[in-house]
């Protein structure tokens, strides 16, 4: 799976969309999980309604919401009041049996609020030298991660 980058501004809401084949994933609940380390497990943040037919109902876990358009085939995750610690690698998942298929890998980047004059030193950005010219931009806030880019911030 390629990784799609979604950028949001600190303090604001970020909407992440994960398209999928609605027939292929018929009857399957969806989930949003956070990747723990490059090789680590994906820790469930929130999942859609226990009843698949009610997947359109928004479910919240803290500041993260999930809703699923099961006919149109779009899973939407909303991160409200985006914070620097929300930056990182996530997955949209389709659940079947005890297993999960990855629908999309997502890198969330948190940008400094241009109206916030506090020190932005704790916000993580990918290396400035990286070129995104060929990246596929789905929305103004998203792009695909280029080959060779590192999806995790460097650890000090």
């Amino acid at each position: 799976h390629n990784t799609t980058v979604f950028q949001g501004v600190a303090g604001q809401s970020l909407q992440v969309s994960c398209p999928y084949d609605s027939m292929k994933h018929w009857g399957r609940r969806k989930a949003w999980c956070r990747q723990l380390g490059e090789k680590g497990p994906c820790q469930r943040v929130v999942s859609t309604h226990n009843l698949w037919l009610l997947s359109f109902l928004r479910r919240w876990n803290g500041s993260t919401a999930i809703t699923d358009d099961t006919l149109g085939g779009t899973l939407t995750i909303t991160l409200r009041n985006l914070q620097p610690h929300d930056a990182g690698l996530y997955q949209c998942q389709s659940l079947h049996g005890s297993e999960a298929d990855t629908l999309r890998k997502v890198l969330v980047e948190v940008l400094a609020d241009p109206l916030d004059h506090r020190d932005a030193g704790d916000l993580w950005f990918p290396g400035e030298s990286e070129s995104f010219e060929d990246a596929h931009v789905e929305h103004s806030i998203s792009r695909s991660l280029l080959e060779g880019e590192i999806p995790f911030p460097p650890t000090s």
Partner: antibody, heavy 123, light 107 residues
Framework: EVQLVQSGAEVKKPGESLKISCKGS????????IGWVRQMPGKGLEWMGI????????RYSPSFQGQVTISADKSISTAYLQWSSLKASDTAMYYC????????????????WGQGTMVTVSS | EIVLTQSPATLSLSPGERATLSCRAS??????LAWYQQKPGQAPRLLIY???KRATGIPARFSGSGSGTDFTLTISSLEPEDFAVYYC?????????FGGGTKVEIK
Amino acid sequence: EVQLVQSGAEVKKPGESLKISCKGSGYSFTSYWIGWVRQMPGKGLEWMGIIYPGDSDTRYSPSFQGQVTISADKSISTAYLQWSSLKASDTAMYYCARAGHYDDWSGLGLDVWGQGTMVTVSS
Amino acid sequence: EIVLTQSPATLSLSPGERATLSCRASQSVSSYLAWYQQKPGQAPRLLIYDASKRATGIPARFSGSGSGTDFTLTISSLEPEDFAVYYCQQSSVHPYTFGGGTKVEIK
């Protein structure tokens, strides 16, 4: 009528290649997973693998990975099971079956079955 | 892979009697279990999915129960056409394994 029609019986020699087919009709072939099941003479059912014809996403049972190839041609609503080099132990009845759609259950229920293709491998 | 053990291997009963077939999984499969019927020379037929829901067109005398590791298929009153081999199948974890089958034969 929703149905899966499989190709006819085959008699082959060890080492030969073979491709059997399963043609769907009466429903949107690209919208349902298709599974393959083996039944050796006088024995039970064995899960081989599954394919989603819409994008050819395929999952194999470890027992059959590398032994067979599952594929599909959505333009003619047909799924395939093939061998590059048959063995006598491949002698069996092979079934294709459609995985149904169930609201609020993401499990697999094979609701429509082909009539089966008998493959005999003998020198 | 998950191993499904069906018991008994053979069940000898008379028409009108109640048949109770068991399927035990080597680890929990939640409700991701289906039951199939197969008659000689025919392809299998789906009877039960989600451990307890009858497939389309399946008579009410067939019922399924259980969750986790222990499942039961019950035929409340055997009809002559019910004498066949019955298989359970899990779809919790791939590969989606079948049980070895239970043959229900006429006593």
